[in-house]
Amino acid sequence: DAHKSEVAHRFKDLGEENFKALVLIAFAQYLQQCPFEDHVKLVNEVTEFAKTCVADESAENCDKSLHTLFGDKLCTVATLRETYGEMADCCAKQEPERNECFLQHKDDNPNLPRLVRPEVDVMCTAFHDNEETFLKKYLYEIARRHPYFYAPELLFFAKRYKAAFTECCQAADKAACLLPKLDELRDEGKASSAKQRLKCASLQKFGERAFKAWAVARLSQRFPKAEFAEVSKLVTDLTKVHTECCHGDLLECADDRADLAKYICENQDSISSKLKECCEKPLLEKSHCIAEVENDEMPADLPSLAADFVESKDVCKNYAEAKDVFLGMFLYEYARRHPDYSVVLLLRLAKTYETTLEKCCAAADPHECYAKVFDEFKPLVEEPQNLIKQNCELFEQLGEYKFQNALLVRYTKKVPQVSTPTLVEVSRNLGKVGSKCCKHPEAKRMPCAEDYLSVVLNQLCVLHEKTPVSDRVTKCCTESLVNRRPCFSALEVDETYVPKEFNAETFTFHADICTLSEKERQIKKQTALVELVKHKPKATKEQLKAVMDDFAAFVEKCCKADDKETCFAEEGKKLVAASQAALGL
């Protein structure tokens, strides 16, 4: 369905409000350092142009591609070279190379100030004074800090953000109403960003086939009653949506996502019995709800997998005729029977099955060769099961903070070259797997834990890719998407690491720590712990625990002192000396 004017087509499909919001997100995700006002100006210019094309699709430039229109607009920014350096060279290229160039310059860790939340009354005044600008600013600030945030989902977050202010700014206790809602949106937003980042990494680093395999496994678990052909159609459509969003084609992505939600709801009888409530909601809520919907019940009468995939004489014939279709069917059949497995485990099993068929279908007696293929699955299944059991026991014993500390030590010893802020951020997130997943029954633990760990380890991979500092991280991140977690789990202490010098400044603390939130105080202590391990990678758990206990006592003591600053100065020196002695520094 070719349109004379792509920009007019998308404007009409999406409506002015969503069109403007999505163009703002797109621009902020590309030019992450540009001021808000500059972006608003660019968006308004694009919107006015789109309206002329709606009025007359034959008007000048209306036939240009969205990449051409948007790229030309971005390249009008006067300070491009000063602000972005070599990214300005993108503007010398032609499409599609120019867009690829912009994509390559997206920064997962932009040098932007932390978002500080103003007082509730200040926020409510700003909201009432100019609601439109207030909400645009939210989109802009999130998009520039999360350049791969799933744009249609960000519209859903903005809708909830608006609803929170609309409700709470009229409440008797504004803060009690608003702050928990904003905390929830912040935490959900970070999780949503990280999940989408993995989808984009999967597509960009490992290709469409890898993403499709992931989607087959996940959708088959979620919709086990759907036929393989139905799942395949959904996978194809979902792949298109995410390819578009990850490629910066946000208008097409949002439009296609809406079409996919419409299709799913029109065909829910052949997809899942769990979609009814989702499909009664408005568009943004509907799409979000479908993406999060619980797994449908498994059909009761599913036959054994062995018949079609091991015992049949036609295995090699079926495999040879259409390899990816046959492997897709295997993955579909295995996944719909195993909602208790993680997606990455299902993909490892499919890869093992594929490798076995590649080898055996060329053998003298193929059936004899692949007859025991399912036996090879047992250790692959047991490895994550055992790991999750051990780590959930440790989490239950230690609690979240100390469990995070155990992971901080573990990962700093594995990859000590990684920057301290990255190690703290990643290990804290790894540690959250305990409270997120260990409360679940056995049947839900593995999909919760291992698929969450895949998302967190991808954060490490994308941050490390910007500035590679460790071959071990590069290897685990690039060799196999589905084996990243086992690869990191298998790493031992890095014996090639040259320990960092002891620097007393790193362990000097001031009274300002006393006014920090509990979370920020934890981060300070965890930063010190990482630095300790970098100085003394061979330190035992007991040594590190003793130093950290002394440190916690020191902070507590000085925060209660009348002259806090003097306490931190004098007691701090003693603590540093005692720690050096305890660790043999």
């Epitope: 070259q417 500092v469 460790s470 040259v498």
Partner: nanobody
Framework: QVQLVESGGGLVQPGGSLRLSCAAS????????MSWVRQAPAKGPERVSA????????IYADSVKGRFTISRDNAKNTLYLQMNSLKPEDTAVYYC??????????PGQGTQVTVSS
């Protein structure tokens, strides 16, 4: 933007000396251990030497022990490699990297060292 610019390479006779420099910018140089890595034609990268963030800890590949010395000047954001008693097998492109990576950390092209009579 991380930038690592290597210099000081050249053509030298066996037994001769060279001093390589690596000027760093775009990151907190003094916070990171650094490495010198070399890649000879048709061979994989080899980590020659590494130094801790403050400069007191060093390690060397067996093939260069006693001949090469790594050092750094954190005030100047510069890493050095003093190469003495050079051998033909030291011929390679030498580049500096952050941490223990053998992947070039920035757009630097490395510096060519050729040992030949």
């Amino acid at each position: 933007q991380v930038q690592l610019v290597e210099s000081g390479g050249g053509l030298v006779q066996p037994g001769g000396s060279l001093r390589l420099s690596c000027a760093a910018s775009g990151f907190t140089f003094g916070q990171f251990g650094m490495s010198w890595v070399r890649q000879a034609p048709a061979k994989g990268p080899e980590r020659v030497s590494a130094i801790s963030s403050g400069g007191s800890g060093t390690i060397y590949a067996d093939s260069v022990k006693g001949r090469f010395t790594i050092s750094r000047d954190n005030a100047k954001n510069t890493l050095y490699l003093q190469m003495n008693s050079l051998k033909p097998e030291d011929t390679a492109v030498y580049y500096c990297t952050i941490g223990s990576s053998t992947t070039p950390s920035g757009p630097g092209q490395g510096t060519q060292v050729t040992v030949s009579s």
